[in-house]
């Protein structure tokens, strides 16, 4: 027997649809109606014929009441050909549910998102996560996407992005995002954060993650910071192959003082980066190649310095380092 | 409309045995986590056992109080759910609520309630 | 066991003002960015009704007058304004962790 599309968890939490079928029957999607978290993946489908049997152009406001019903609050849809028509009616028709997070991932849109109608209502999320998502409509595609969103979002992720650089000029300012994600987007470069970090775009970000982006140098990534505006208090570079030198003719750069944690583990380091913030509440330099232990001289004044998985490091020993904490157990690195 | 009916309940001496039944519809029973949930006279909210689903291998949970004497099982064939009460105590006199679970809360439908009283 | 304490134990109120029950818990309910804290409501010879799920989701039928915050330990359900039918004792219950538990119950009456 074919298994169900969809599986239902039994405490009706969580619903996961699987469409594999050539002509799935969307209908079992029914059963997810009364779960929290729902994760719709079309098996890789072309839902271009799905325009035809719905109305896209339809007033969302005869849905207002079933849709107001729904529980959902996390949805996931994966693995499709969208076309942007229907994309923006399936918005449209949320921005009446109670949907606080949206993930999408490995979508293919084509055609571009028509402009929000006056009367139309964005939807209201907190979070909007992105992973493999390509866009008919190049770099204008965040500026598309955030007119049919109401300015609330607070947390904002962007991974292996086809064209991670936004038409700036276009994109308005998400005056309440605190996170932004940019990680696993390794052709990104600090070139292409500097394109991404539309200035002053981006005035509450507290949390900036840019993990495997290519990134060369924290000078670097510090004078994309200063050119966009974005001071961040906890930053994330873990997982790039980290230069520790910096080039004598770049400029010196000045960390935001907001900064207080910085995660440099994974970087490849075999000696601590010069230009690093003067005072941090956490830095992390776990699972890097350095060969013994930093001077005082070469760290920040730091409350909370991880140094676990190096090659220096004999599980046990401590380090001389005020404040240092370590597990004394190497870790998976 | 999901109804459940629980019913068993009943006056029983201590160390006696009582089996409760609850009787469910209006819903595809054999997907859901069931709970019994009790309050003794005057006080709070209990709750005392659950039954996962087939899917999950219909796992039990019980509450310390009455782990070793109560057994809950369930029949999705007839779309009900059991207690079996066994060596009662007379702490175990309460309001016996059969719960059914939605959106990731394990108690929004309550049946009515059957009491048991184990009284000397 | 995750031990929920409630407080205050009863609260007597003036129609149309407002009500504020808290709800601590000894470690936190959160998981995966849920708060698994539920809010419900009981009348004299009545079974319990959900009114809050998942913090701060108003059940379906609930009038708006309810509302549930809060996240990992610290969580409250307010009435506001309060009304005559809303005399009853109002629970907390989680079940993040095994065993699910209810705090021991605050009863509302109106001055």
């Known amino acids: 027997t074919t298994p169900e599309p969809c599986e239902l968890d039994d405490e009706d939490f969580r619903c996961v649809c699987n469409f594999s079928e050539p002509q799935p029957d969307w209908s079992e999607a029914f059963q997810c109606v009364s779960a929290v978290e729902v994760e719709i993946h079309a098996g890789g489908l072309n839902l271009e014929p799905f325009l035809k049997r719905v109305d896209a152009d339809a007033d969302p406001r005869q849905y207002a009441d079933t849709v107001k019903a729904l529980r959902v609050r996390r949805l996931t849809v994966g693995a499709a050909q969208v076309p942007a028509q229907l994309l923006v009616g399936a918005l449209r028709v949320l921005a009446y549910s109670r949907l606080k997070e949206l993930t999408l991932e490995d979508l293919k849109i084509t055609g571009t998102m028509p402009p929000l109608p006056l009367e139309a209502t964005g939807l209201a999320l907190s979070s909007l996560r992105l992973r493999n998502v390509s866009w008919a409509t190049g770099r204008s595609w965040l500026a598309e996407l955030q007119q049919w969103l109401k300015p609330g979002l607070k947390v904002l992720s962007i991974a292996q992005a086809h064209s991670p650089a936004f038409s700036c000029e276009q994109v308005r300012a998400f005056p309440a995002l605190t996170s932004l994600d940019l990680s696993d987007n390794p052709g990104l470069g600090e070139r292409g954060l500097m394109a991404a970090l539309c200035p002053h775009k981006f005035p509450a970000i507290q949390n900036l993650a840019l993990r495997n982006t290519g990134m060369e140098t924290p000078t670097g990534v510090c004078a994309a910071l200063a050119a966009a505006g974005v001071q961040p208090h906890s930053l994330d570079l873990s997982h790039n192959s980290l230069r520790a030198t910096v080039n004598p003719s770049a400029p010196r750069c000045m960390w935001s003082s907001a900064l207080n944690s910085l995660n440099l583990s994974f970087a490849g380091l075999e000696q601590v980066p010069k230009g690093l913030p003067a005072k941090l509440r956490v830095l992390d330099l776990s699972c890097n190649r350095l060969n013994r232990a930093p001077q005082p001289d070469e760290l920040p004044e730091v409350d909370n310095l991880t140094l676990d998985g190096n090659p220096f490091l004999v599980p046990g020993t401590a380090l001389p380092h005020e404040g240092s904490m370590n597990s004394g157990v190497v870790p998976a690195c | 409309e999901v109804q459940l009916v629980e019913s068993g309940g009943g006056l029983m001496q201590p160390k006696g045995s009582l089996k409760l039944s609850c009787a469910a519809s209006g819903f595809t029973f054999k997907t859901y986590a069931l709970n019994w949930v009790r309050q003794a006279p005057g006080t709070g909210l209990e709750w005392v056992a659950r039954i996962r689903s087939k899917s999950n291998n219909y796992t039990t949970y019980y509450a310390d109080s009455v782990k070793d004497r109560f057994t809950i099982s369930r029949d999705d064939s007839q779309n009900m759910l059991y207690l079996q009460m066994n060596n009662l105590k007379t702490e175990d006199t309460a309001m016996y609520y059969c719960?059914?679970?939605?959106?990731?809360?394990?108690?929004?439908?309550w049946g009515q309630g059957t009491l048991v009283t184990v009284s000397a | 066991n995750i031990v929920l304490t409630q407080s205050p134990a009863s609260l007597a109120v003036s129609l149309g003002q407002r009500a504020t029950i808290s709800c601590r818990a000894s470690e936190s309910v959160d998981s995966y960015g849920n708060s698994f804290m539920h809010w419900y409501q009981q009348k004299p010879g009545q079974p319990p009704k959900l009114l809050i799920y998942?913090?701060?989701n108003l059940e379906s039928g609930v009038p708006a007058r309810f509302s549930g915050s809060g996240s990992r330990t610290d969580f409250t359900l307010t009435i506001d304004p309060v009304e005559a039918d809303d005399v009853a004792t109002y629970y907390c219950q989680q079940n993040n962790g095994d065993p699910y538990t209810f705090g021991g119950g605050t009863k509302l009456e109106i001055i």
């Open positions: 719960v059914r679970p939605q959106s990731g809360t394990s108690f929004a439908y």
């Open positions: 998942l913090a701060s």
